[in-house]
Amino acid sequence: APISSHCRLDKSNFQQPYITNRTFMLAKEASLADNNTDVRLIGEKLFHGVSMSERCYLMKQVLNFTLEEVLFPQSDRFQPYMQEVVPFLARLSNRLSTCHIEGDDLHIQRNVQKLKDTVKKLGESGEIKAIGELDLLFMSLRNACI
């Protein structure tokens, strides 16, 4: 089971109208540039076989991947939203840095790896898709970690 006291984010992180609006605006801008509507990165399958108590840890993995492999490489795009949203998400990632899981997390890594593989397979359009799903990332983090 996760070390649950560390796999928590304060509700206030998701109640800041300005940065929430910027996150959702960034997602919308990117989704307008996303031509591949048949693929969904963040959805029910991501959580398959993952208990409610493990979902924040899973979302931490997705958040870190999104920051390191998607947002940082694409940081010059979708301005001015990107320059404000990336530090916000990085702060959430930092607050989850001590969120770990005790025991086997193979089932979680397997699910996250599928998401990573899909993004990599789609190349730049996969990165755009991931940015277009930042609203879903935001909501999933909120539901899993507060």
């Epitope: 109208p17 929430t20 959702f24 919308k28 969904r40 959805g43 029910e44 398959h48 609203d135 879903l136 909501m139």
Partner: antibody, heavy 119, light 107 residues
Framework: QVQLVESGGGLVKPGGSLRLSCAAS????????MSWIRQAPGKGLEWVSA????????YYADSVKGRITISRDNAKNSLYLQMNSLRAEDTAVYYC????????????WGRGTLVTVSS | DIQMTQSPSTLSASVGDRVTITCRAS??????LAWYQQKPGKAPKLLIY???SLASGVPSRFSGSGSGTDFTLTISSLQPDDFATYYC?????????FGGGTKVEIK
């Protein structure tokens, strides 16, 4: 193309039971959350229940909790609504609709099936 | 539960008119709002999702705006086919909830 066809409606006495079905085609049924929504004659829309693609999560409106059970059979591309202890206020057209996940709209709806609860 | 309040409940308009319908949520729902059109005896049809995204096949005269608690559906130039009832719906949280509907009728 996407098709949702409801069946099983009819006239039932108060306290009676009914099982509604929704046959889905034209999409990968197991990928979608499915909902039941009802509309009383001359009234607005009321969401009744939803079920996740795997069937592992279910959700109900307070007005039907304990009396209604939603289920699905992904092998048969079918959605069900078991309605027990029916009341006059359950009289409505019942629609099934699909939405990809939790944060997705109901993008396709069936034509509905009428349930009348009356003695 | 999140309450959705739609106004007006009835709206009389003429072909070519610009029509605006508003929807207010009892708490913040981000942009998780959809608009549906329903004609008598028919199932609802999705028009707008994520508050402002146009659903596939929907004419561009329909547009949506807003976020948080206040939302608007606008028909830029009303056409004969647009006389119907319109519903807003939030999908930020279960239970899903609908507004009471706005009937757009011929003046």
């Amino acid at each position: 193309q996407v098709q949702l066809v409801e069946s099983g409606g009819g006239l039932v006495k108060p306290g009676g039971s009914l099982r509604l079905s929704c046959a889905a085609s034209g999409f990968t049924f197991s990928d979608y959350y499915m909902s039941w929504i009802r509309q009383a004659p001359g009234k607005g829309l009321e969401w009744v229940s939803a079920i996740s693609g795997s069937g592992g999560s279910t959700y109900y409106a307070d007005s039907v909790k304990g009396r209604i059970t939603i289920s699905r059979d992904n092998a048969k591309n079918s959605l069900y609504l078991q309605m027990n202890s029916l009341r006059a206020e359950d009289t409505a057209v019942y629609y099934c609709a699909r939405g990809l996940w939790v944060w997705d709209p109901l993008d396709y709806w069936g034509r509905g099936t009428l349930v009348t609860v009356s003695s | 539960d999140i309450q959705m309040t739609q106004s007006p409940s009835t709206l009389s308009a003429s072909v070519g008119d610009r029509v605006t319908i508003t929807c207010r949520a009892s708490e913040g729902i981000y942009h998780w709002l959809a608009w549906y059109q329903q004609k008598p005896g028919k199932a609802p049809k999705l028009l707008i999702y994520k508050a402002s995204s146009l659903a596939s096949g929907v004419p561009s005269r329909f547009s949506g705006s807003g976020s948080g608690t206040d939302f608007t559906l606008t028909i830029s130039s009303l056409q004969p086919d647009d006389f119907a009832t319109y519903y807003c719906q939030q999908y930020s949280n279960y239970p899903l909830t609908f507004g009471g509907g706005t009937k757009v009728e011929i003046k």
